[in-house]
């Protein structure tokens, strides 16, 4: 039993990377629980994370149904045990999230350099095409399959022996760059969606250097 009143959730925030999408909110519950609902602008309110004491809810399963839709979530607060509710009679207490459009807003995850291969004065650098949680016909799609030509990569590279950097761009997952014969190079890539206004770029990949496993070298 208790007299602590139920409070509405606040600071509803979408956290999304490569379409793995979690709604977070405050406060940590005291004598209350939460249920989350998610909807498209024109669709149903679908309940998730029923009667939870968590302050986050994984909504990935819902948003991957159509990543180009705009979603809205709301978090309901319910009294736990025999606690009074502050909602007006019969009206559940809830708070709305900001709108979220996965295709336009999901953060691009840190990419990985899959391999590099040197042939003479050319190096082919391949970026791993990461699998997402978006499905089509039961198969998980890669980042490239979801974004198509909207997705590009920026390669930053330098000679191992110097700090001067160069960049190259591609809208595939491969770069073919000119290098000086006999020199080792270090590479880092960044995913980018140039058409976006927010979350345009990923963080940099780990740096990979020639002469340290990753690639093959042919004179």
């Amino acid at each position: 039993s208790g007299t602590t009143n139920t409070v509405a959730a606040y600071n509803l925030t979408w956290k999304s990377t490569n379409f793995k999408t979690i709604l977070e909110w405050e406060p940590k519950p005291v004598n209350q629980v939460y249920t989350v609902q998610i909807s498209t602008k024109s669709g149903d309110w679908k309940s998730k994370c029923f009667y939870t004491t968590d302050t986050e809810c994984d909504l990935t399963d819902e948003i991957v149904k159509d990543v180009k839709q705009t979603y809205l979530a709301r978090v309901f607060s319910y009294p736990a045990g025999n606690v009074e509710s502050t909602g007006s009679a019969g009206e559940p207490l809830y708070e709305n999230s900001p709108e979220f459009t996965p295709y336009l807003e999901t953060n691009l995850g840190q990419p990985t350099i899959q391999s590099f291969e040197q042939v003479g004065t050319k190096v082919n650098v391949t970026v791993e095409d990461e699998r997402t949680l978006v499905r089509k016909n039961g198969t998980f799609l890669t980042l490239r399959q979801v974004f198509g030509n909207d997705l590009g990569y920026i390669l930053t590279y330098r000679k191992s022996s110097s700090s001067g950097k160069k960049t190259a761009k591609t809208n595939t997952n491969e770069f073919l760059i000119d290098v000086d014969k006999g020199e080792n190079y270090c590479f880092s890539v960044q995913a980018v969606i140039p058409s976006r206004t927010v979350n345009r770029k990923s963080t940099d990949s780990p740096v990979e250097c020639m002469g340290q496993e990753k690639g093959e070298f042919r004179e």
Partner: antibody, heavy 121, light 107 residues
Framework: QVQLVQSGAEVKKPGASVKVSCKAS????????MHWVRQAPGQGLEWMGI????????VYAQKFQGRVTMTRDTSTSTVYMELSSLRSEDTAVYYC??????????????WGQGTMVTVSS | DIQMTQSPSSLSASVGDRVTITCQAS??????LNWYQQKPGKAPKLLIY???NLETGVPSRFSGSRSGTDFTFTISSLQPEDIATYYC?????????FGGGTKVEIK
């Protein structure tokens, strides 16, 4: 196998309290919500509330708020439902029912056999 | 609270008949609806969850569908052992609520 076994029938006087138990077996007790549902003679089903056995958190239907208390004992994998200030309209069969897996979290996939509670002066 | 209006309240059909029960929600509940069968003197049994998914071990003659706020439960070919009362239950909104039940009898 997975089952819920409830305590026996009770006869109570108006104003008294009743405590019904529900012992779970055959699955990991803490991983599934437990609900209580009642059914008055010849009537339909009525949801009373839910308890999360892992933390003991409860949520009750507003109709029963202040009169019902659901608790659990993890050492014996048992949940309890206590209803106080009994009146004649509380005469019903009381069922515990397990909430389903994450796929169907609020579908009641396993039910106890029911406990008949009669309130009569 | 969400009202679940179930109809008919009772019906009588012959063995082999197709039987249809409907449940209407007072507001949108997505596909958050389950169907139960309750035989006399027994606890209810889950048949369908999330409007159309058949619970493991339930015969395929039972099915469920949704159109907006209207939900349909169908027995494609009524069997003598299907004599029971059937209930719908929504879980999209607190508190969880049940329909009033449909009693199915054999002609």
């Amino acid at each position: 196998q997975v089952q819920l076994v409830q305590s026996g029938a009770e006869v109570k006087k108006p104003g008294a309290s009743v405590k019904v138990s529900c012992k779970a077996s055959g699955y990991t007790f803490a991983n599934y919500y437990m609900h209580w549902v009642r059914q008055a003679p010849g009537q339909g089903l009525e949801w009373m509330g839910i308890i999360n056995p892992s933390g003991g958190i409860t949520v009750y239907a507003q109709k029963f708020q202040g009169r019902v208390t659901m608790t659990r004992d993890t050492s014996t994998s048992t949940v309890y439902m206590e209803l106080s200030s009994l009146r004649s309209e509380d005469t019903a069969v009381y069922y515990c029912a397990r909430g389903g897996s994450k796929v169907a979290a609020l579908a009641f996939d396993i039910w106890g056999q029911g406990t008949m509670v009669t309130v009569s002066s | 609270d969400i009202q679940m209006t179930q109809s008919p309240s009772s019906l009588s059909a012959s063995v082999g008949d197709r039987v249809t029960i409907t449940c209407q929600a007072s507001q949108d509940i997505s596909n958050s609806l389950n169907w139960y069968q309750q035989k006399p003197g027994k606890a209810p049994k889950l048949l369908i969850y999330d409007a159309s998914n058949l619970e493991t071990g339930v015969p395929s003659r039972f099915s469920g569908s949704r159109s907006g706020t209207d939900f349909t439960f169908t027995i494609s070919s009524l069997q003598p052992e299907d004599i029971a009362t059937y209930y719908c239950q929504q879980y999209n909104f607190h508190p969880l609520t049940f329909g009033g039940g449909t009693k199915v009898e054999i002609k």
